[in-house]
């Protein structure tokens, strides 16, 4: 099949003793191969401060990933999720301020 | 860990057609694989299918596939199975269970509904 | 289709012993995403399955220490190192890495 180019959403959950977890969702891609990684000032996050989902099919033909990490609250702008797939690349940063959410979807 | 509330007991004449709940609560049900799985009395487990709540995709054991039709309602947080042309090889516990996706326990089945006895009898 | 086949199909015990049940697939159970999902499942009577083990070792929370499971390939096995009152009941090995999906016949865990 031809490429389909994946969704990223970036959510941070509830704050918890000055930390917050910062999730990056890659969904609806195909081919299955992606990269998906946390970096911090520009450079990956080693592989035991990530925890990472499973690549899992949605049902409708393509694919979903995800990956997160705990940082502290207030270094939000240092965070950035970088995605790799089928040659396209992308980076995502943590939603600042009140706003919970961002996504975008590759072309 | 929340809660997965299945509908009561049916009792159907072959032929006719029955729907299934599950309704959820206490987690975020979007991020959610529901599967359902039929057991007869005395017997083990068969899984019939699994609806991504994300997004309405599915995926069916091709052995219920012209048998069982999964749909999602979003808004009520509610998983449905209706089950066809029922027969009394139909006769059946049917459970719901999840999958949390973006939880950390990596297991098709971690939590569970206490299911619905559905019973085909003219 | 993938055959869950387990042995043995009952298990009288003494509480306090240790107890092992086997599952064997008609196949390997690795997921496209390289993951093995073999899990088990403890069904008391009147009751729904719960899940002990996934992805062949990992214990799911507020499991016992006392069930472990392990295995690769087409081999695989829980254990439970001192059987208690609340173990008994029926196991079920399930694999969730080819559709369609597919359960073990069971054990019944029972009193000697």
């Known amino acids: 099949g031809s490429t389909v180019p994946p969704m990223v959403n970036v959510t941070c959950s509830e704050v918890s003793e000055g930390n917050i977890t910062v999730t990056c969702r890659a969904s609806s891609f195909y081919p299955r191969n992606i990269t998906l990684t946390w970096r911090q000032d520009g450079v990956s996050l080693s592989h035991n401060t990530q925890q990472w989902g499973d690549v899992l099919p949605d049902g409708n033909g393509t694919y979903q990933t995800w990956v997160a990490t705990r940082i502290r609250q207030g270094e939000e702008q240092r965070f950035t999720c970088y995605m790799e797939h089928s040659g396209n690349h992308g980076t995502h940063p943590v939603p600042s301020g009140n706003s919970h959410h961002h996504h975008h979807h590759h072309h | 860990q929340g809660q997965m509330q299945q509908s009561g007991a049916e009792l159907v004449k072959p032929g006719a057609s029955v729907k299934l709940s599950c309704k959820t609560s206490g987690f975020t049900f979007s991020d959610n694989y529901i599967s359902w799985l039929k057991q007869k009395p005395g017997q083990s487990l068969e899984w019939i299918a699994w609806?991504?709540?994300?997004?309405?995709?599915?995926s069916y054991n091709q052995k219920f596939r012209d048998k069982a039709q999964l749909t999602v309602d979003t808004s009520s947080r509610t998983a449905y199975m209706q089950l066809s042309s029922l027969t009394t090889e139909d006769s059946a516990i049917y459970y719901c269970?999840?999958?949390?996706?973006?939880?950390?326990?990596?297991?098709?089945?971690?939590?569970w509904g206490r299911g619905t006895l559905v019973t085909v009898s003219a | 289709d993938v055959l869950m086949t387990q042995t043995p199909l009952s298990l009288p015990v003494s509480l306090g012993d240790q107890a092992s049940i086997s599952c064997r697939s008609s196949q390997h159970i690795v997921h496209s995403n390289e993951n093995t999902y073999l899990e088990w499942y403890l069904q008391k009577p009147g009751q729904s399955p719960k899940l002990l083990i996934y992805k062949v070792s990992n214990r799911f929370s507020g499991v016992p220490d006392r069930f472990s499971g392990s295995g690769s390939g087409t081999d695989f096995t829980l254990k439970i190192s001192r059987v208690e009152a609340e173990d008994l009941g029926v196991y079920y090995c399930f694999q969730g890495s080819h559709v369609p999906w597919t359960f073990g016949g069971g054990t019944k865990v029972e009193i000697k």
């Open positions: 269970a999840r999958h949390d996706y973006y939880g950390t326990s990596g297991a098709w089945f971690a939590y």
């Open positions: 609806i991504y709540a994300g997004t309405g995709g599915s």
